[in-house]
């Protein structure tokens, strides 16, 4: 039952992200930023199951990429970062297996390229912000909160996926 497995993985990832905080976020209030989280892309009502999975996959892939950089390694406690990356990697594998399974069941799987592009642009804005802020501790703290927000939002998409099972 992939949606169930993924939901548990998502919860574990959220807990790890929560534990990764290194500085008080209240010292970073002035650094907060609107990254334009594409909330409509996490509304499962508008997608086929394969489309929803591909949006989740893109979000997790981009998160994995973001936290796999050298700058990220310098920003976070190593063991937590490794656990977080491992959790994301496992989720990506699960989702890929699920896509293969679903494609075999659906007549004509539609690609939702606009949604995937929206997620990519969202992460580009996050990367640009980090670059502009010179990967400061506060910049990373703001990004950590933002990623937690996007993961929470993706939970809604997973709930809808589960209802479609």
């Amino acid at each position: 039952d992939l949606p169930q497995t993924h939901s548990l993985g998502n919860r574990r990832a959220l807990i790890l992200l929560a534990q990764m905080g290194r500085i008080s976020p209240f010292s970073c209030l002035k650094d907060r930023h609107d990254f334009g989280l594409p909330q409509e892309e996490f509304d499962g009502n508008q997608f086929q199951k394969t489309q929803a999975i591909s949006v989740l996959h893109e979000m997790i892939q981009q998160t994995f990429n973001l936290f796999s950089t050298e700058d990220s390694s310098a920003a976070w406690e190593q063991s937590l970062l490794e656990k977080f990356s491992t959790e994301l990697y496992q989720q990506l594998n699960n989702l890929e297996a699920c896509v293969i399974q679903e494609v075999g069941m659906e007549e004509t799987p539609l690609m939702n390229e606009d949604s995937i592009l929206a997620v990519r642009k969202y992460f580009q804005r996050i990367t640009l912000y980090l670059t502009e802020k010179k990967y400061s501790p506060c910049a990373w703290e703001v990004v950590r909160a933002e990623i937690m927000r996007s993961f929470s939002l993706s939970t809604n998409l997973q709930k809808r996926l589960r209802r479609k099972d």
Partner: antibody
Framework: QVQLQESGTVLARPGASVKMSCKAS????????MHWVKQRPGQGLEWIGV????????TYNQKFKDKAKLTAVTSANTAYMELSSLTNEDSAVYFC?????????????WGQGTTVTVSS | DIVLTQSPASLAVSLGQRATISCRAS??????????MHWYQQKPGQTPKLLIY???NLESGVPARFSGSGSGTDFTLNIHPVEEEDAATYYC?????????FGSGTKLEIK
């Protein structure tokens, strides 16, 4: 479902200290900041401070820095607030409230409130 | 500290009409695309309930007759059409900087 259960009414003498509790259930207690808010009878709301139960990190409204002390015991899923050197001005209802939407710092779930009455 | 001034202190609105509540901050609470102003409803003997976050985002489960607008220092909560159950005190709260503060409240009475 998320619930915040606060301790009951407290009657205290001026100069004394009181410690109230807020037991959380229905969510991961260690991963959400917990705010404390004061409301005097017939008056508005005042933000006292916030604690992160996961590591005990606290941030206070300077006005309450020497008045309130926030703590949490993760094994009991309970947050505490101790008020010291009580005066009549401390007579109020005190709410614990869960932080919401990460760094937007809004408050979604609220305890039912602990009423503190300071009287000689 | 940022002072939030709510007006009016109280208002009476007929059933089905529009209620407009204003909240003015002594300093901007907006930064990089977000306005850190939120609205709560508190009914007598109850705890506050979040209605609107980030100036204009409706909290899940809150009726669409509630709406928020504004940026910088001037914010508005609108309720239209007003219903009997909307009788309550409404508070704005900012999270733009420390300490977070609340407005003094606006008591809404339904005529």
């Amino acid at each position: 479902q998320v619930q915040l259960q606060e301790s009951g009414t407290v009657l205290a003498r001026p100069g004394a200290s009181v410690k109230m509790s807020c037991k959380a259930s229905g969510y991961s207690f260690t991963t959400y900041w917990m705010h404390w808010v004061k409301q005097r009878p017939g008056q508005g709301l005042e933000w006292i401070g916030v604690i992160y139960p996961g590591n005990g990190d606290t941030t206070y409204n300077q006005k309450f820095k020497d008045k309130a002390k926030l703590t949490a015991v993760t094994s009991a899923n309970t947050a505490y607030m101790e008020l010291s050197s009580l005066t009549n001005e401390d007579s109020a209802v005190y709410f614990c409230t869960r932080n919401y939407k990460y760094d937007y710092y809004t408050m979604d779930y609220w305890g039912q409130g602990t009423t503190v009455t300071v009287s000689s | 500290d940022i002072v939030l001034t709510q007006s009016p202190a109280s208002l009476a609105v007929s059933l089905g009409q529009r209620a407009t509540i204003s909240c003015r901050a002594s300093k901007s609470v907006s930064t990089s695309g977000h306005s850190y102003m939120h609205w709560y409803q508190q009914k007598p003997g109850q705890t506050p309930k979040l209605l609107i976050y980030l100036a204009s985002n409706l909290e899940s489960g809150v009726p669409a007759r509630f709406s928020g607008s504004g940026s910088g220092t001037d914010f508005t909560l609108n309720i239209h059409p007003v219903e009997e159950e909307d009788a309550a005190t409404y508070y704005c709260q900012h999270s733009g900087e420390l300490p977070f503060t609340f407005g003094s409240g606006t008591k809404l009475e339904i005529k």
